[in-house]
């Protein structure tokens, strides 16, 4: 039975040209995390495998940095980065847990600063 829950940052905003940390947290389960996939809509951004480390998709290599932890840092944000992001936790023996984050990249310099994981 899957007892775990995924906590995410929910809806966040950031300024164009800035950076943001995407983070999810799996709790309430003793299952071992074997891999975390980060996806934007249907596009793979990165994989963090417990045995093989990080893999960043080539098309994002120059502006995605792994971490902190199992999180992902997006840099040099553009308006095109606006959209849904998913963290997909592969665990044993529970199976797969998925979390959703919506990122809005704003043109103006008055992006909300309430995002819990936002970095300057």
């Amino acid at each position: 039975m899957m007892t775990g829950t995924i906590e995410t940052t929910g809806n966040i905003s950031a300024e164009k040209g800035g950076s943001i940390i995407l983070q999810c947290h799996l709790s309430s389960t003793t299952a071992q995390v074997t891999q975390v996939n980060w996806e934007q809509q249907d596009q793979l951004l990165a994989i963090c495998n417990a045995d093989l480390g990080w893999h960043i998709s080539p098309s994002f290599k120059d502006r995605v940095a792994p971490g902190p932890g199992l999180g992902l840092t997006l840099q040099s944000l553009t308006v095109n980065d606006t959209g849904e992001y998913f963290c997909i936790y592969h665990t044993y023996p529970d199976g797969t847990y998925t979390g959703r984050i919506f990122l809005e990249v704003l043109e103006s310099s008055v992006a909300e600063h309430g995002a819990r994981f936002q970095i300057p």
């Epitope: 906590e7 940390i21 947290h25 799996l26 709790s27 003793t30 995390v33 975390v36 963090c48 495998n49 417990a50 093989l52 480390g53 990080w54 893999h55 960043i56 290599k61 120059d62 995605v64 940095a65 792994p66 971490g67 902190p68 932890g69 199992l70 840092t73 994981f117």
Partner: antibody, heavy 117, light 107 residues
Framework: EFQLQQSGTVLARPGASVKMFCKAS????????MHWVKQRPGQGLEWIGA????????NYNQKFKGKAKLTAVTSASTAYMELNSLTNEDSAVYYC??????????WGQGASVTVSS | DIVLTQSPATLSVTPRNSVSLSCRAS??????LHWYQQKSHGSPRLLIK???QSISGIPSRFSGSGSGTDFTLSINSVETEDFGMYFC?????????FGGGTKLEIN
């Protein structure tokens, strides 16, 4: 087998610079952060910073910005840390460790730096 | 920066007894907490990742619990090889930080 092999003991004068290495083997060097940690005699662990060879991303402890410079040569699977303007406070054992998102699971044997005039 | 406070600084224990070591964070780090053991003149060794996840090769007598700001490393029936320093470390945000350590010594 995974291994992180660090430089040997270094004795340096105050004001000098030292550059130490951490040679990785047994895994894909570009897939893991390489962290550097300082430990003064009888003291705890202090995080200096980390370098990600996959795209040269870095993160530093603010305290060590300007003191430590982290680099790597991916073709040699070797990470480097340079410490400049050495003082007695820099006398310590320095560890490298790898992290792929799941804790620092492998550590080097440590490199001892002694600053003395 | 997130400050991790470990207590007690020193813990004296008789072999085969069980002990608990505490690590408290200055703000919530959710489950991004790892534990390390360091024996005299040795390198640190990862014991537990993400609060409670086990590490291959680490004896099952080591276990972890907690979330948010309060965490515990438990050693069920301490053995002589367990004596040394124990450190917690957070990976919730940069910069990563370590706790000051707990020294586990023979009573």
């Amino acid at each position: 087998e995974f291994q992180l092999q660090q430089s040997g003991t270094v004795l340096a004068r105050p004001g000098a610079s030292v550059k130490m290495f951490c040679k990785a083997s047994g895994y894909s060097f570009t897939r893991y952060w390489m962290h550097w940690v300082k430990q003064r005699p009888g003291q705890g662990l202090e995080w200096i910073g980390a370098f990600y060879p996959g795209n040269s991303a870095t993160n530093y402890n603010q305290k060590f910005k300007g003191k430590a410079k982290l680099t790597a040569v991916t073709s040699a699977s070797t990470a480097y840390m340079e410490l400049n303007s050495l003082t007695n406070e820099d006398s310590a054992v320095y560890y490298c460790s790898r992290e792929g998102g799941y804790g620092m699971d492998h550590w080097g044997q440590g490199a001892s730096v002694t600053v003395s005039s | 920066d997130i400050v991790l406070t470990q207590s007690p600084a020193t813990l004296s224990v008789t072999p085969r007894n069980s002990v608990s070591l505490s690590c408290r964070a200055s703000q919530s780090i959710r489950n991004n907490l790892h534990w390390y053991q360091q024996k005299s003149h040795g390198s640190p060794r990862l014991l537990i990742k993400y609060v409670s996840q086990s590490i291959s090769g680490i004896p099952s007598r080591f276990s972890g619990s907690g979330s948010g700001t309060d965490f515990t490393l438990s050693i069920n029936s301490v053995e002589t090889e367990d004596f040394g320093m124990y450190f917690c470390q957070q990976s919730n945000s940069w910069p990563y930080t370590f706790g000051g350590g707990t020294k586990l010594e023979i009573n």
